[in-house]
């Protein structure tokens, strides 16, 4: 057992028919030592008296609030979360599995620049009785600060007859230089609360590898005379580090119709314009890349051929 | 120490051409190195993440970007970074500073190329001639380093009396990889900015 | 099974044009664009121009502007290139390729031998 | 027109060894560069797209890198069935262009 916060504990059962559980000894918060007794969240059975309860922990049933009263007045409460661990792993219900870029994979990060701020987010089924909070640091052994804001539900989806909620949080390396080489990386350690369910989320990433540029903004259409070809330019996205002439991007120009399946002009270039094939009901994408460390694509940035 | 924006240099191009083909040479290395060795831990997230060249080197801090200066975490991770007064410096003294970065520069290539050179000198007595390095790889480091056109001492290459322990020594080969993959891309922003400038 | 057949071998006199054909099987032929290009005998690869079946799109090389004419025809899924002013330089294979990117190919004709001989 | 020089433009080689093939671009083309293989008397056949991107069908002993005017096409041991000749095309612009060819010999 161990303290999450004042007055909140967590147990860690091993999850299996007839486990034995864990034993667990509660201690009233009082000067007090007579009359004491004990009461299970909002039932009024008395459980035990005296200043310490020792119970026997062993499924939800016996999580939740415990409170030592005397005379009526309440003295103290200690709420007992369980943690799980099912064949020597900790369990995973409560957030979904994104899948992407690998299997077990809950948390996902991006940042938008080289300047320590990363938001990260994560996905579940559940709509209530649920409560996050989030630490991260650089490093593990010596941890460097990194500062979290409060997770917030940032968006709903529905997928076939359930509801999926995603929740995110944006951090920011207290002491960040854009231009250092990485050597320690990043952990956001995410505790996860559902009803009397504990379970934590642990993500390890360097920010070089999490970066996804905005996508490129101002895209303008020049045509060429006499031919079938367009110049497209933008420019660099007004979140991406600078100066750009060190922290440079590369970008893939596209002209696609509505379907994926259509035949596509597609260059590639490290200028801010570039000349292409247009079509009717055709749209010119671009989108952009770090030039010198190949992490994630940003989204594209479209206007219509015509 | 940091980068101001300095008059170009007619020999800075090169050195951005070689950089970009050191750069290409070791992620390809590294990419050949992670297929190779796959049931080695060779992967970012397997490795320690060492830096042969700390406090021996200070090329992020040499080569900082004049718009960087004013970010004071760019600055004190070092005692050596050099803290401007105002944003301009005189010419003299932006070529110094230009010298000190291109420098720093030169000495991580001759750090790396010894290392990577001892440590092929090991991998060719595997008998099971696993890997090797890319003599592409070695040819590029040392094409900028004639860029860059510095002289200093010979390192002398390391030699080992005591029978190599391959695994060991593969497992080195990717914790240098990774290292010197990063540096390049340090080296490649550094004269993308000059170059520019 | 994408694949392009072209028209046989023609024999050529200076001056006089020429005609190859290039036809589609498998997928849709205004699915994707075809080019044209040549190859010298003993020599590389000459890009010559391309058509977008679906509109008429084309756009030339500069060295075969005014000279070459692509043509399509969805109907019968056929490709044309036409060549005029024919010189004996122009003696080569004319390959037809095609891919749903504009700029490079993945499905190539097997070539048609074009003569030019007085 | 952007001029494609590929070296060498005769490659001996010995059946299981690697073989190495340059492109060099007369000016930077980002990674618009393919790479394709050509056998007498037949249409060239798409190895590479975008200077590194695999083809499906093609194996894997093919590769290919570089980006701006340099690129290498490795073939990681070579097969009987390899021996041809290879060219390499830009497509960062109009007219398109190839290589004239690195021929790859028995030794």
């Known amino acids: 057992i161990w303290e999450l916060k004042k007055d909140v504990y967590v147990v860690e059962l091993d999850w299996y028919p007839d486990a034995p559980g864990e034993m667990v000894v509660l201690t009233c918060d009082t000067p007090e030592e007579d009359g004491i007794t004990w009461t299970l969240d909002q039932s009024s059975e008395v459980l035990g008296s005296g200043k310490t309860l020792t119970i026997q922990v062993k499924e939800f049933g016996d999580a939740g609030q415990y409170t030592c009263h005397k005379g009526g007045e309440v003295l103290s409460h200690s709420l007992l979360l369980l943690h799980k661990k099912e064949d020597g792993i900790w369990s995973t219900d409560i957030l979904k599995d994104q899948k992407e870029p690998k299997n077990k994979t809950f948390l996902r990060c991006e940042a938008k620049n080289y300047s320590g701020r990363f938001t990260c987010w994560w996905l579940t089924t559940i709509s209530t009785d649920l409560t996050f909070s989030v630490k991260s640091s650089r490093g593990s052994s010596d941890p460097q600060g990194v500062t979290c804001g409060a997770a917030t539900l940032s968006a709903e989806r529905v997928r076939g007859d359930n509801k999926e909620y995603e929740y995110s949080v944006e951090c920011q390396e207290d002491s960040a230089c854009p231009a250092a080489e990485e050597s320690l990386p990043i952990e956001v350690m995410v505790d996860a609360v559902h009803k009397l369910k504990y379970e934590n989320y642990t993500s390890s990433f360097f920010i070089r590898d999490i970066i996804k540029p905005d996508p490129p903004k101002n895209l303008q259409l020049k045509p060429l005379k006499n031919s079938r070809q367009v110049e497209v330019s933008w420019e660099y996205p007004d979140t991406w580090s600078t100066p750009h002439s060190y922290f440079s991007l590369t970008f893939c120009v596209q002209v696609q119709g509505k379907s994926k399946r259509e035949k596509k002009d597609r260059v590639f270039t490290d200028k801010t314009s570039a000349t292409v094939i247009c079509r009717k009901n055709a749209s010119i994408s671009v989108r952009a890349q770090d030039r010198y460390y190949s992490s994630s694509w940003s989204e594209w940035a479209s206007v219509p051929c015509s | 120490r940091n980068l101001p924006v300095a008059t170009p240099d007619p020999g800075m191009f090169p050195c951005l051409h070689h950089s970009q083909n050191l750069l290409r040479a070791v992620s390809n290395m590294l990419q050949k190195a992670r297929q190779t060795l796959e049931f080695y831990p060779c992967t970012s997230e397997e490795i320690d993440h060492e830096d042969i060249t700390k406090d021996k080197t200070s090329t992020v801090e040499a080569c900082l970007p004049l718009e960087l200066t004013k970010n004071e975490s760019c600055l004190n991770s070092r005692e050596t970074s050099f803290i401007t007064n105002g944003s301009c410096l005189a010419s003299r003294k932006t070529s110094f500073m230009m010298a000190l970065c291109l420098s720093s520069i030169y000495e991580d290539l001759k750090m790396y190329q010894v290392e990577f050179k001892t440590m092929n000198a090991k991998l060719l007595m595997d008998p099971k001639r696993q890997i090797f390095l890319d003599q592409n790889m070695l040819a590029v480091i040392d094409e900028l380093m004639q860029a860059l056109n510095f002289n200093s001492e010979t390192v002398p290459q390391k030699s080992s009396l005591e029978e190599p322990d391959f695994y060991k020594t593969k497992i080195k080969l990717c914790i240098l990889l990774h290292a010197f993959r990063i540096r390049a891309v340090t080296i490649d922003r550094v004269m993308s900015y000059l170059n520019a400038s | 099974q994408v694949q392009l057949v072209q028209s046989g071998a023609e024999v050529k006199k200076p001056g006089s044009s020429v005609k190859v054909s290039c036809k589609a099987s498998g997928g849709t032929f205004s699915d994707y664009y075809l080019h044209w290009v040549r190859q010298a005998p003993g020599q590389g690869l000459e890009w010559m121009g391309w058509i977008d079946p679906e509109n008429g799109d084309t756009e030339y090389a500069p060295k075969f502007q005014g000279r070459v004419t692509i043509t399509a025809d969805e109907s019968t899924s056929t490709a044309y290139m036409e060549l005029s002013s024919l010189r004996s330089e122009d003696t080569a294979v004319y390959m037809c390729?095609?891919?749903?990117?504009?700029?490079?190919?993945?499905?190539w004709g097997q070539g048609t031998l074009v003569t030019v001989s007085s | 027109d952007i001029v494609m020089t590929q070296s060498p433009l005769s490659l001996p080689v010995t059946p299981g060894e690697p073989a190495s093939i340059s492109c060099r671009a007369s000016?930077?083309?980002?990674?618009?560069l393919h790479w394709y293989q050509q056998k007498p008397g037949q249409a060239p056949r798409l190895l590479i797209a975008f200077a590194s991107q695999s083809i499906s069908g093609v194996p894997s002993r093919f590769s290919g890198s570089g980006s701006g005017t340099d690129f290498t096409l490795t073939i990681s041991s070579l097969q009987p069935e390899d021996f041809a000749t290879y060219l390499c095309q830009q497509s960062n612009s109009f007219p398109l262009t190839f290589g004239q060819g690195t021929k790859v010999e028995i030794k």
């Open positions: 000016q930077s083309i980002s990674i618009n």
């Open positions: 390729a095609r891919n749903k990117e504009l700029r490079y190919f993945d499905v």
